[in-house]
C-alpha cells in the first residue's frame, strides 16, 4: 500500500522539515525560515509560534518542530502548549478576580497556584490535631484521643510555627 501510495502521490515522500512544492512540480522543498513541518507529506509548512512579550522562548523553532513558550517570572503557564500566562500568588493565597488574596481561616494553599483548600478534619478519622494548620500548611493529625489517655505513651505536640492567620476576603 505504501508503495502504491507513493507512486500515486509523490508528496508522501517529502520528509518532516520539507513541504511538497506544487509550484516546482511537487519537489520536496525545505521549509522557509520561521516555519516548520513536523510530519512528512505536508503540502505547506506551518508558521513558527513567536514567544513575544511575557511569553519567553523555552525551545527554539526548528524545521521539524514548533517553538515552545513559557511565562516570564511571576506568572505560570496555562492551557495547551502554554497558550496563557496566569499570575503566581504566594503560598497561603489564592488567585481571584481581585488578584491574590489570603486564604480564609480554616483553609490553606501550599503552592504558588491553585485554590485554598480546607484543613483536614482529623476527627473524621478519629484522630486529634497534632500540629495546627496555617494559611500555608494543612493540619497534622496525630493519634486518636483515646491513645493519649493516661497510661498511654503521651506525645507532646510541637508548638505551631505561628498562629493560623485569618484574613477576610
Amino acid at each position: 500500500f505504501e508503495r502504491t501510495r507513493s507512486l500515486q502521490d509523490p508528496c508522501s515522500n517529502c520528509p518532516a522539515g520539507t513541504f511538497c512544492d506544487n509550484n516546482r512540480n511537487q519537489i520536496c522543498s525545505p521549509c522557509p525560515p520561521n516555519s516548520f513541518s513536523s510530519a512528512g507529506g505536508q503540502r505547506t509548512c506551518d508558521i513558527c509560534r513567536q514567544c513575544k512579550g511575557v511569553f519567553r522562548t523555552r525551545k527554539e523553532c526548528s524545521s521539524t518542530s514548533n517553538a515552545e513558550c513559557d511565562c516570564t517570572p511571576g506568572f505560570h503557564c496555562l492551557g495547551a502548549g502554554c497558550s496563557m500566562c496566569e499570575q503566581d500568588c504566594k503560598q497561603g493565597q489564592e488567585l481571584t478576580k481581585k488578584g491574590c488574596k489570603d486564604c480564609c481561616f480554616g483553609t490553606f494553599n501550599d503552592q504558588k497556584r491553585g485554590i485554598c483548600r480546607p484543613w483536614t478534619n482529623c476527627s473524621l478519622d478519629g484522630k486529634s490535631v497534632l500540629v495546627n494548620g496555617t494559611k500555608e500548611r494543612d493540619v497534622v493529625c496525630g493519634p486518636s484521643p483515646a491513645d493519649l489517655s493516661p497510661g498511654a505513651s503521651s506525645v507532646t505536640p510541637p508548638a505551631p510555627a505561628r498562629e493560623p492567620g485569618h484574613s477576610p476576603q
Epitope: V54, L78, S83, M84, E86, Q87, L95, K97
Partner: nanobody, 123 residues
C-alpha cells in the same frame, strides 16, 4: 491577526497623571475580560487591574486602588488606564493583556499581550 498595542507612556513627575491606551484588533473585543499588568525594572510581572466585558466590573491591586482607573470603550476597541498621584514605584513597562476564554470562572490566564509602554515617574 489578534493584536494589542499600548500607547501613552512617558516621563512624568511624582504626583502627576498619565493616561495609557490599548488598541485591540483581530478579535471580538467586547467578549473578553481585559487586564493591565506591569513590570518594574529588574522585577517580575505584577497584575494591576482588570475589567469585565461590558465595563461593569473592575478590580485593582491594593497599591494602585484609588489612584488608577481602568475603563474601556467597546465601540472603539480600546482599553484605558488613567493614572493619578503617580509615584516612583509606579515606574514600569505597562502591558495590556486579554483574559483567555472563561477568564474569571475556571482560571485567570491571559492569552494575548501587547508589546508594552514604558512609564517613568521621576523628578
Amino acid at each position: 491577526e489578534v493584536q494589542l498595542v499600548e500607547s501613552g507612556g512617558g516621563l512624568v513627575q511624582p504626583g502627576g497623571s498619565l493616561r495609557l491606551s490599548c488598541a485591540a484588533s483581530g478579535f471580538t473585543f467586547g467578549s473578553y475580560w481585559l487586564n493591565w499588568v506591569r513590570q518594574a525594572p529588574g522585577k517580575g510581572l505584577e497584575w494591576v487591574a482588570n475589567i469585565n466585558q461590558d465595563g461593569s466590573e473592575n478590580y485593582y491591586v491594593d497599591s494602585v486602588e484609588g489612584r488608577f482607573t481602568i475603563s474601556r470603550d467597546n465601540a472603539k476597541n480600546s482599553l484605558y488606564l488613567q493614572m493619578h498621584s503617580l509615584r516612583a514605584e509606579d515606574t514600569a513597562v505597562y502591558y495590556c493583556a486579554r483574559g483567555g476564554e472563561d477568564y474569571g470562572n475556571s482560571h485567570f490566564g491571559m492569552d494575548v499581550w501587547g508589546q508594552g509602554t514604558m512609564v517613568t515617574v521621576s523628578s
